[in-house]
């Protein structure tokens, strides 16, 4: 159901100062400028809805241009506690403290927030990504070392009058960007405390947040070019489905990935691609400007709606799931990576999904909204879409009841 009822002042409208406050690209993450400490130290911070720690580089590292120098901040307070965060590949560890934090192109407020000062890391920082830390925007349940460490957004809402909601517009370029282009280009917007009408077209459709840890949602149906994958919907959410700006790909559970690839292969069979392409190990290239978008299917994910037995669908184009790769063989070619991959931890709706949509993380009402992004990449024949309502029965059965564990994701 669309959400057009009146809301409290400041909740909707224009947030000019926050529009275009993100930089980056799907492969290396989107970042916002933040300041930490007194006097303020400016850092670029990865926006990650798949984790819950605010963590910044706090020691020299070959991939960092700058880092948080706690000794230079008069407002830094040491919590005398360490934190260690391992990922599937890589890790970071550091020391916990608090300091004053603000977002220059965000709400005009300063908050005291928990900060993990990263002193050691492995395969965490990305060479050339231009970010020096991570802003985990998910819930306290998955914060490290435990859920007693209040996440940044919780602190922001508690200490200010900022409404408990943020929205993201991630703008994929549709073509590879070199380092200087990334610095000069618009990467999108993070609207803190509201929704900006100018960033989307059509209506916003909302899906419930199933549980407040990750931003967990329920997928009830998947279609490739309108053809139902016809799987038990529990498979789509095994063991969870999350919306994660810190992950590049659309990641799917093994069985779902295999069925989806089989269907995408069949739909695009006018051209044959090596297995390595479907596994994300090889790029496929075309002479510049000749990418045959039309041979690739659209992918629709149906999400549980806010009303009983009602769902809506979000549809992405190949322009979202074929990710342009910089550093290609030559500028004569347009090369792409297949940005759908296999997952052992459930469905992850990463940047390639989010780049099609304006996504509203309405924490206050425990729901996530989707609308067609005003900046999504499309062609003259097809566009990303958010459509509904559809009648879908027994949607509650699509959720998987996971044994409780503690895990987090980042740009995989």
């Amino acid at each position: 159901e669309t959400d057009e009822e009146p809301e409290e002042p400041g909740r909707r409208g224009s947030f000019v100062e926050m529009v275009d406050n993100l930089r980056g690209k799907s492969g290396q993450g989107y970042y916002v400028e933040m300041t930490v400490g007194s006097p303020p130290q400016t850092l670029n911070i990865l926006v990650d809805t798949g984790s819950s720690n605010f963590a910044v580089g706090a020691a020299p590292h070959p991939f960092l241009h700058r880092y948080y120098q706690r000794q230079l901040s008069s407002t830094y307070r040491d919590l005398r506690k360490g934190v260690y965060v391992p990922y599937t590949q890589g890790k970071w560890e550091g020391e916990l403290g608090t300091d004053l934090v603000s977002i220059p192109h965000g709400p005009n407020v300063t908050v005291r927030a928990n900060i993990a000062a990263i002193t050691e890391s492995d395969k965490f920082f990305i060479n050339g990504s231009n970010w020096e830390g991570i802003l985990g925007l998910a819930y306290a349940e998955i914060a490290r070392p435990d859920d007693s460490l209040e996440p940044f957004f919780d602190s922001l809402v508690k200490q200010t009058h900022v409404p408990n909601l943020f929205s993201l517009q991630l703008c994929g370029a549709g073509f590879p960007l070199n380092q200087s282009e990334v610095l000069a280009s618009v990467g999108g917007s993070m609207i803190i405390g509201g929704i900006d009408h100018s960033l989307y077209t059509g209506s916003l459709w909302y899906t419930p947040i199933r549980r407040e840890w990750y931003y967990e949602v329920i997928i009830v149906r998947v279609e490739i070019n309108g053809q139902d994958l016809k799987m038990d919907c529990k498979e789509y959410n095994y063991d969870k489905s999350i919306v994660d700006s810190g992950t590049t790909n659309l990641r799917l559970p093994k069985k779902v990935f295999e069925a989806a690839v089989k269907s995408i292969k069949a739909a695009s069979s006018t051209e044959k691609f090596p297995d390595g392409f479907w596994l994300g190990e090889q790029l496929v290239c075309w002479q510049a400007g000749t990418t045959p978008w039309n041979i690739f299917p659209v992918i629709s994910l149906y999400l549980m709606g806010e009303v009983t037995n009602q769902s809506f669908r979000i549809t992405i184009l190949p322009q979202q799931y074929l990710r342009p790769v910089e550093d290609v063989a030559t500028s004569q070619d347009d090369c792409y990576k297949f940005a759908i991959s296999q997952s052992s931890t459930g469905t992850v709706m990463g940047a390639v999904i989010m780049e099609g949509f304006y996504v509203v993380f309405d924490r206050a009402r425990k729901r996530i909204g989707f609308a067609v992004s005003a900046c999504h990449v499309h062609d003259e024949f097809r566009t990303a879409a958010v459509e509904g309502p559809f009648v879908t029965l027994d949607m509650e059965d699509c959720g998987y009841n996971i044994p409780q564990t503690d895990e987090s994701t980042l740009m995989t």
């Epitope: 390595g276 790029l283 063989a329």
Partner: antibody
């Protein structure tokens, strides 16, 4: 702009050694194969050796196996051809050429050597 | 090693002529054949890759065909700048062997 620049050629006595360099720019060196191809005066093209920096795979023509060694320094985007035990029949213009590896699949297949350097002359004579 | 036998070794033709050069591999090389053009004192230039794909910037009068063992380079209407030596090369198996070349001269 893609560029391959060879250097290191010159006059050397039979049995001597020489190291050729191929400095690359304007493309992803790591995911390319670098080939050395030579051309004796008035003759056709002869493939000599190749290296794929990302896999470390090297390959040689029978005529140079055991005498020539191809290598690459990815930090410098440079490939090298170390030539030992040189013979008169090794006299030629040596070209380095670039080929996208199988990391790049072109919708119609795999590309060939699409960029070449200007060549460097190696003369083996007493 | 795979031998690439190119024919003819030379040919004389006039501007506007249709020219065909053939190359035969001693065993199947799938479609992994390239054609290069070389002018005196210059490096070779790629014309055709994967047997029939025209390389970017190469005039459409050049075309390639064939697969397996038999391959053809065709110049539909010879232009003055096309007088050069042409080489086929297989890149299916190492060593990547070249044909001996075909010199296209002015009649």
């Amino acid at each position: 702009e893609v560029q391959l620049v060879e250097s290191g050629g010159g006059l050397v006595q039979p049995g001597g050694s020489l190291r050729l360099s191929c400095a690359a720019s304007g493309f992803n060196f790591y995911y390319s194969s670098i080939h050395w191809v030579r051309q004796a005066p008035g003759k056709g093209l002869e493939w000599v050796a190749s290296i794929s920096p990302y896999s470390g795979y090297t390959s040689y023509a029978d005529s140079v196996k055991g005498r020539f060694t191809i290598s690459a320094d990815t930090s410098k985007n440079t490939a090298y051809l170390q030539m030992n035990s040189l013979r008169a029949e090794d006299t030629a213009v040596y070209y380095c050429a670039r080929q996208p590896t199988h990391y790049y699949y072109y919708a119609k297949g795999y590309k060939a050597m699409d960029y070449w350097g200007q060549g460097t002359l190696v003369t083996v004579s007493s | 090693d795979i031998q690439m036998t190119q024919s003819p070794s030379s040919l004389s033709a006039s501007v506007g002529d249709r020219v065909t050069i053939t190359c035969r591999a001693s065993q199947s090389v799938s479609s992994a054949v390239a054609w290069y053009q070389q002018k005196p004192g210059k490096a070779p230039k790629l014309l055709i890759w994967w047997a029939s794909s025209l390389y970017s910037g190469v005039p459409s009068r050049f075309s390639g065909s064939g697969s397996g063992t038999d391959f053809t380079l065709t110049i539909s209407s010879l232009q003055p700048e096309d007088f050069a030596t042409y080489y086929c090369q297989q890149y299916s198996y190492s060593p990547f062997t070249f044909g001996q070349g075909t010199k296209v001269e002015i009649k």
